[in-house]
Amino acid sequence: EVEKTACPSGKKAREIDESLIFYKKWELEACVDAALLATQMDRVNAIPFTYEQLDVLKHKLDELYPQGYPESVIQHLGYLFLKMSPEDIRKWNVTSLETLKALLEVNKGHEMSPQVATLIDRFVKGRGQLDKDTLDTLTAFYPGYLCSLSPEELSSVPPSSIWAVRPQDLDTCDPRQLDVLYPKARLAFQNMNGSEYFVKIQSFLGGAPTEDLKALSQQNVSMDLATFMKLRTDAVLPLTVAEVQKLLGPHVEGLKAEERHRPVRDWILRQRQDDLDTLGLGLQG
């Protein structure tokens, strides 16, 4: 907290400019008008203020907007955003994707901070759903974003947004998340033809039920082992040896290298040895 002191004669700031970097903290407090700061926030980032000086500027904005900053100020916060606490951010009402992008840019290259997580949460809740443009933006900055959401949060993703999802965005998703996303992907890609459909749906198959895997096995899709290893155990177990052979095509030989790992191990254990022997891979049930 900076003490209230009168501004020295001739030091009253008429605009936010480089001369302010020479002001002591108390001078910034006394000589910079909060309303002026709010209207010229876009200039702050061009000026090499110290962290201590930024604390003073934040304090002035907090006094001016005790109920939370308006979006016109938020959009131009720049590095001052790093000074905000999750509690500060919870007071905001961010509706513009441009504002979101501007603030994410400040944190670019770093892991998702509690501040960023709160900002995203406020933004998505304000929109009511995770639309395609928002998802595009968030996964561009944080490829793991989708998998950081709970199954409940993922349920608000409309099928149309699924087009924005790239395979790497699903790398860290667990089965419960894929259980929610798979039906949405199935709906989003339903009008595509066989081979194109498989390319798109492949990343989501960790949420696919047995009947969909059986259907895919009839379409010569040649699923790779990496995808097969991500399938739900309960979906894989009922598949016959013939169905797995058709599903994997030439990749079926890869089962040998994965025979000690789930879900391959669980599947092998539940097959008749005679059937396994037809694969010629030496798999032991």
């Epitope: 667990d174 089965p175 419960r176 309960d234 000690r260 790992h261 539940r270």
Partner: antibody
């Protein structure tokens, strides 16, 4: 409600064979979704998985114990058993039998039986 | 074998505290990691399976997260009955392995 109960001698002499049986009640050892494991815990130490068996008779053992372990299943008695040969004092532990439900983990455990290896 | 390294090996906490226990696998275990609670003289009890799924009947203050090699068990608000030893376990590889355990004691 599936329950497991271990039984067997509490004292075994060094170099002899430890034999334990686990009786499954309230469910079938022939369950499609379950394998049946033995796990042990030396006094004051952590848990060590010994091995599992499926009702078909297929087994999988801890590599460090494999040469001394045999797990078998008797579907008619709804039981599975553990034999550990050439025991030493290092095999003194509480021995648990547990159900490994394929979609979760060791979700049902016996209460455990203490086995001491001593002459 | 996949080695499971748990940390810390013990911790002291108060009722109401948020407690986090971590488990690191020596190689990827995908999401096939389970968490157990064990009280003295009792058999372990399954809390979390498949890294993040809550076992039926387990209080919602317990949660799990992680995939690959790094996994976390969190107790959001420690209760008196939660003082116990916690173990992680991987079942991805056929040779199942447990972590060394974390003893949660009263501060």
């Amino acid at each position: 409600q599936v329950q497991l109960q271990e039984s067997g001698p509490g004292l075994v002499k060094p170099s002899e064979t430890l034999s334990l049986t686990c009786t499954v009640s309230g469910g079938s050892v022939s369950s499609y979704y379950s394998t049946w494991s033995w796990i042990r815990q030396p006094p004051g130490k952590g848990l060590e998985w010994i091995g599992y068996i499926y009702y078909s008779g297929s087994t999988n053992y801890n590599p460090s114990l494999k040469s001394r372990v045999t797990i078998s299943v008797d579907t008619s008695k709804n039981q599975f058993s553990l034999k550990l040969s050439s025991v030493t004092a290092a095999d003194t532990a509480v021995y648990y039998c547990a159900r490994d439900f394929v979609l979760s983990g060791f979700d049902i455990w016996g209460q455990g039986t203490m086995v001491t290896v001593s002459s | 074998d996949i080695q499971m390294t748990q940390s810390p090996s013990s911790l002291s906490a108060s009722v109401g505290d948020r407690v986090t226990i971590t488990c690191r696998a020596s190689q990827s275990s995908r999401y096939y990691v389970n968490w157990y609670q064990q009280k003295p003289g009792k058999a372990p009890k399954l809390l979390i399976y498949a890294a993040s799924s809550l076992q039926s009947g387990v209080p919602s203050r317990f949660s799990g997260s992680g995939s690959g090699t790094d996994f976390t068990l969190t107790i959001s608000s420690l209760q008196p009955e939660d003082f116990a030893t916690y173990y992680c376990q991987q079942s991805y590889d056929a040779s199942y392995t447990f972590g060394g355990g974390t003893k949660v004691e009263i501060k």
